[in-house]
Amino acid sequence: RSLQDTEEKSRSFSASQADPLSDPDQMNEDKRHSQGTFTSDYSKYLDSRRAQDFVQWLMNTKRNRNNIAKRHDEFERHAEGTFTSDVSSYLEGQAAKEFIAWLVKGRGRRDFPEEVAIVEELGRRHADGSFSDEMNTILDNLAARDFINWLIQTKITDRK
């Protein structure tokens, strides 16, 4: 699967259905634009997105976990890796091994403070937004942790 093949509803937000030519948001934007106050720092926006995207990527990868389990035999037959899911693409490279090593370096296998820190930091930044709810859902599901644990326990990185 490619990056664009993700569960889109997790990234979905309500949006105005107005025609852009008569969209009040558009007129407000033009006003702010002409006043020179509209273009805040895109870099800051990207800063806030990076941690969210990483967790979302992990979530997206975890969603393929069941598919891998169902296709376990096929996976064994294709030892060199022919799947195009995010998980197998990720594991085919050295990235997974480096990532796992980074996560478990110097700590117990079930202790992943980075993931918690990322989500908590985002929760603080977006305490009153829907973004925070999305992060809380991720925390509630412990999806990122579960996925990493699953990776380590199955030693799937050693299948290459």
Epitope: L3, S43, L46
Partner: antibody, heavy 119, light 112 residues
Framework: QVQLVESGGGVVQPGRSLRLSCAAS????????MHWVRQAPVKGLEWVAF????????YYADSVKGRFTISRDNSKNTLYLQMNSLTAEDTAVYYC????????????WGQGTLVTVSS | DIVMTQSPDSLAVSLGERATINCKSS????????????LAWYQQKPRQPPKLLIY???IRESGVPDRFSGSGSGADFTLTISSLQAADVAVYYC????????FGQGTKLEIK
């Protein structure tokens, strides 16, 4: 599969305006941020503008700030770029690009529409 | 903005041989919180739009042949085509997506 089709390009005189459109299909348009990226003849790629999926965040390259406006209509699966006060430096192929799950990473591109600013 | 510089500007390689393209960013694009380098590679064939090949410096996008590989960290990156095929003739661009997106000037790859 993802399809992005740009339209609205053409020849325009300096100082005039043009509006580009990008019709999207094959994915849930309202779930993804969208970008405009341009490529001047025999030149490299330059990011132009970004709009988030819910229209709440819009950003522009310094070179077009104050002249270009990005917008979208999620009910029509369409992205727009309103270009005002055009100059010869704006001559380029304009691509609309779908943002991947990772911000500012472009996983799908349209075929592009050529904008020529000339007197 | 982060400036991306590619080398060489053009490259001629024999079919079946290895092709290597370098990309240097004016500042690090490594995000320490997840140890990922926010660097992507695109391929653009004549009269076509760019196509995403690699993201996070080393992860191949779905459907990209495994002869394409990316490496590097911090501010220095490399795209390698292990065995050049005729279909690989194109211009290759690196792009950082750590900050406001910027591209390298491109490297034109031809067959020797």
């Amino acid at each position: 599969q993802v399809q992005l089709v740009e339209s609205g390009g053409g020849v325009v005189q300096p100082g005039r305006s043009l509006r580009l459109s990008c019709a999207a299909s094959g994915f849930t348009f309202s779930s993804y941020g969208m970008h405009w990226v341009r490529q001047a003849p025999v030149k490299g790629l330059e990011w132009v503008a970004f709009i988030s999926n819910d229209k709440s965040n819009k950003y522009y390259a310094d070179s077009v700030k104050g002249r270009f406006t990005i917008s979208r209509d999620n009910s029509k699966n369409t992205l727009y770029l309103q270009m005002n006060s055009l100059t010869a430096e704006d001559t380029a192929v304009y691509y609309c690009a779908k943002e991947s799950i990772l911000a500012a990473l472009f996983d799908s591109w349209g075929q592009g529409t050529l904008v020529t600013v000339s007197s | 903005d982060i400036v991306m510089t590619q080398s060489p500007d053009s490259l001629a390689v024999s079919l079946g041989e290895r092709a290597t393209i370098n990309c240097k960013s004016s500042q690090s694009v490594l995000y320490s919180s997840n140890n990922k380098n926010y660097l992507a590679w695109y391929q653009q064939k004549p009269r076509q739009p760019p196509k995403l090949l690699i993201y996070w410096a080393s992860i191949r996008e779905s459907g990209v042949p495994d002869r394409f590989s990316g490496s590097g960290s911090g501010a220095d990156f490399t795209l390698t085509i292990s065995s050049l095929q005729a279909a690989d003739v194109a211009v290759y661009y690196c792009q950082q997506f750590y900050s406001v997106p910027t591209f390298g000037q491109g490297t034109k790859l031809e067959i020797k």
